[in-house]
């Protein structure tokens, strides 16, 4: 199984021992660890950080002393913006130049292959992202004729359902990817006006529509049936939690909130808490499981956070081999309790150890 | 050997201009950000400018902006800092230096002497 | 901007002496603080980036601590080769800015 696994630049700034630098990370955790995010400048990738480049390095000599590790270069993210992609994509030597910057920008800095995030295509954007991929993918074989490994395609793909059709066609898309990131998480925020879960494994027992597609089942078979490969699709798993402020005496699933909750002591972004800092948000805290969801949402004060655990990675695991996938994709490294010393269990990535020790349990 | 060689100091009367050159080799020039830092005499660090790789991203001291131009030519490994409108307080040795973490590598600095 | 303070501007000590210089930003600056040396007549070294990283080459009796706007840089034992100038500077935001310095010397 693949264990498909994001690092992210901006950890470096997270104060104290929030900050997260590439030689941090285990080299035998995952299978593949992607560096998020490169950027695109006059139509060529390009650096985002002033100290990527030495990012770069510092990520790629873990392969030094695991040659089995892939590295790969997550291009885009939320703050590229979709109009910047939509721009490139559609036009046709603005495409054909981003295209053949790719190749040589990644053998540079020693990656082994490119994942796009373009969060996300818009309903115009479906073909144009559809032809990037497949030109993207014939232009890796073409460089990679003279006999050099072929470099690798992925892409980082959203959950939603209304976003999965209008944005891609996903059959088609599936030809040319080596392998498809579906990020099962972020099915519920602070806009619903409610707590829940953010990455129910399965629909909640009072979910009604459109509730009912909101949950990672929903999301992993809607792709299925739309013709993706469950060779190819790598299933998501959050090392971070989304949290609420409640907005009364109620503190279960469908309690009315205020807004997100507190930002985290490191990650400092309201409504959202890196699996450490929950692991300090738990000391004191009344810890719940949603049965039907196989996930756990914990409440301390006017405080609700609904989180993955060692738990409900597990039984995620279990159910992305049951579905035959061709593995998990953890987003992120630098979420996970990544050196140690928050969650009390003297282990190193507790929640992603979780999910490799599942994967490789017979 | 990763290495950064300053030219293109010296004598300069005030409102007058030089250009600096820093010559890189032993590494990949072109994927680096790159800095200039200035020292007056028995005085501290000032950072001075600062460019991306690509030359995309520009920043400036607030004291130089508006008449120092930092650029970069990466097919000649070459950084330049344009010095127009030169003030006796801009009397330094000027460094150059490469952006990894920080400033990992620097030039041994070039003198420039702004007088009448 | 960001103003960084390093105090003391100077200080007398003896070889073997443990040594602590701070430094500290008019805002926080997460652990975007480094810490070079330099010798007269040389251009500035390296020592320390992100706070408390040492860079490759830099003995350990070398260390820095601290984040968001207090840092300290201590040395274990003042070695001989130790008696220089030190700034720190931060990374955080341009423009970049360094502290004044701080002249380690002979006893």
């Known amino acids: 199984y693949k264990l498909v696994c994001y690092y992210t630049s901006w950890s470096q700034y997270r104060e104290g021992d929030g900050s997260c630098f590439p030689d941090a990370l285990d080299r035998f955790l995952c299978t593949h660890i992607i560096y998020s995010f490169a950027n695109i400048s006059n139509d060529h990738i390009d650096t985002w950080e002033w100290n990527d480049v030495t990012l770069y390095g510092m990520l790629n000599t873990l392969k030094n002393r695991n040659p089995n590790l892939k590295t790969l270069l997550s291009v885009g993210g939320w703050n590229f913006g979709s109009q910047r992609f939509s721009k490139i994509a559609s036009n046709t030597q603005s495409r054909r130049t981003f295209i053949k910057s790719v190749p040589p920008f990644l053998r540079t800095h020693g990656f082994d292959g490119l994942d796009l995030a373009w969060l996300y295509p818009g309903r115009r954007d479906k073909q144009h992202f559809t032809t990037l991929i497949k030109e993207m993918k014939a232009e890796f074989i073409k460089e990679a004729q003279p006999g050099k490994k072929q470099l690798l395609l992925s892409a980082a793909l959203s959950a939603g359902k209304v976003t999965i059709d209008s944005s891609y066609d996903i059959a088609k898309i599936s030809q040319h990817l080596d392998f498809i990131s579906i990020m099962t998480y972020d099915f519920h925020g602070a806009w619903r006006g409610t707590t829940g879960h953010h990455s129910p494994l399965f629909r909640g027992q009072e979910d009604a529509s459109p509730d009912r597609f909101s949950n990672t089942d929903y999301a992993v078979g809607y792709m299925l049936r739309l013709g993706a490969p469950a060779s190819k699709l790598v299933m998501g798993i959050p090392t971070f939690g989304r949290s609420f402020t409640l907005a009364s005496s109620e503190t279960g699933v469908g309690a009315p909130i205020s807004g997100p909750g507190i930002p985290g002591r490191f990650t400092k972004e309201a409504g959202t808490l890196a699996y450490y800092e929950i692991c300090d948000f738990l000391r004191g805290a009344t810890v719940h499981r949603i049965l039907g969801q196989q996930v756990p949402y914990a409440t301390k004060g006017n405080q609700w956070v609904g989180y993955d655990d060692q738990e409900s990675v597990k039984s995620k695991v279990q159910y992305l081999k049951d579905r035959q996938l061709a593995g998990a994709m953890v987003w992120a490294l630098d979420l996970d309790d990544f050196q140690g010393s928050f969650c009390g269990q003297d282990l190193r990535f507790p929640l992603t150890n979780a999910i490799k020790d599942a994967l490789a349990a017979t | 050997e990763v290495q950064l060689v300053e030219s293109g100091g010296g004598l300069v009367q005030p409102g007058g201009s030089l250009r600096l050159s820093c010559a890189a080799s032993?590494?990949?020039?072109?994927?680096?950000?790159m800095h200039w830092v200035r020292q007056a005499p028995g005085k501290g660090l000032e950072w001075v400018s600062a460019?991306?790789?690509?030359?995309?991203?520009?920043y400036y001291a607030d004291s130089v902006k508006g008449r120092f131009t930092i650029s970069r030519d990466n097919s000649k490994n070459t950084l330049y800092l344009q010095m127009n409108s030169l003030r006796a307080e801009d009397t330094a040795v000027y460094y150059c230096a490469k952006q990894g973490l920080s400033f990992d590598i620097w030039g041994q600095g070039t003198l420039v002497t702004v007088s009448s | 901007d960001i103003q960084m303070t390093q105090s003391p501007s100077s200080l007398s000590a003896s070889v073997g002496d443990r040594v602590t210089i701070t430094c500290r930003a008019s805002?926080?600056?997460?652990?975007?603080l480094n810490w070079y040396q330099q010798k007269p007549g040389k251009a500035p070294k390296l020592l320390i980036y992100a706070t408390s990283r040492l860079q490759s080459g830099v003995p350990s009796r070398f260390s820095g601590s601290g984040s968001g706007t207090d840092f300290t840089l201590t040395i274990s034992s003042l070695q001989p080769e130790d008696f220089a100038t030190y700034y720190c500077q931060q990374s955080y935001s341009f423009p970049y800015t360094f502290g004044q310095g701080t002249k380690v010397e002979i006893k």
């Open positions: 805002q926080s600056i997460s652990n975007w």
């Open positions: 032993g590494f990949t020039f072109s994927s680096y950000a």
């Open positions: 460019i991306s790789s690509s030359g995309g991203s520009i």
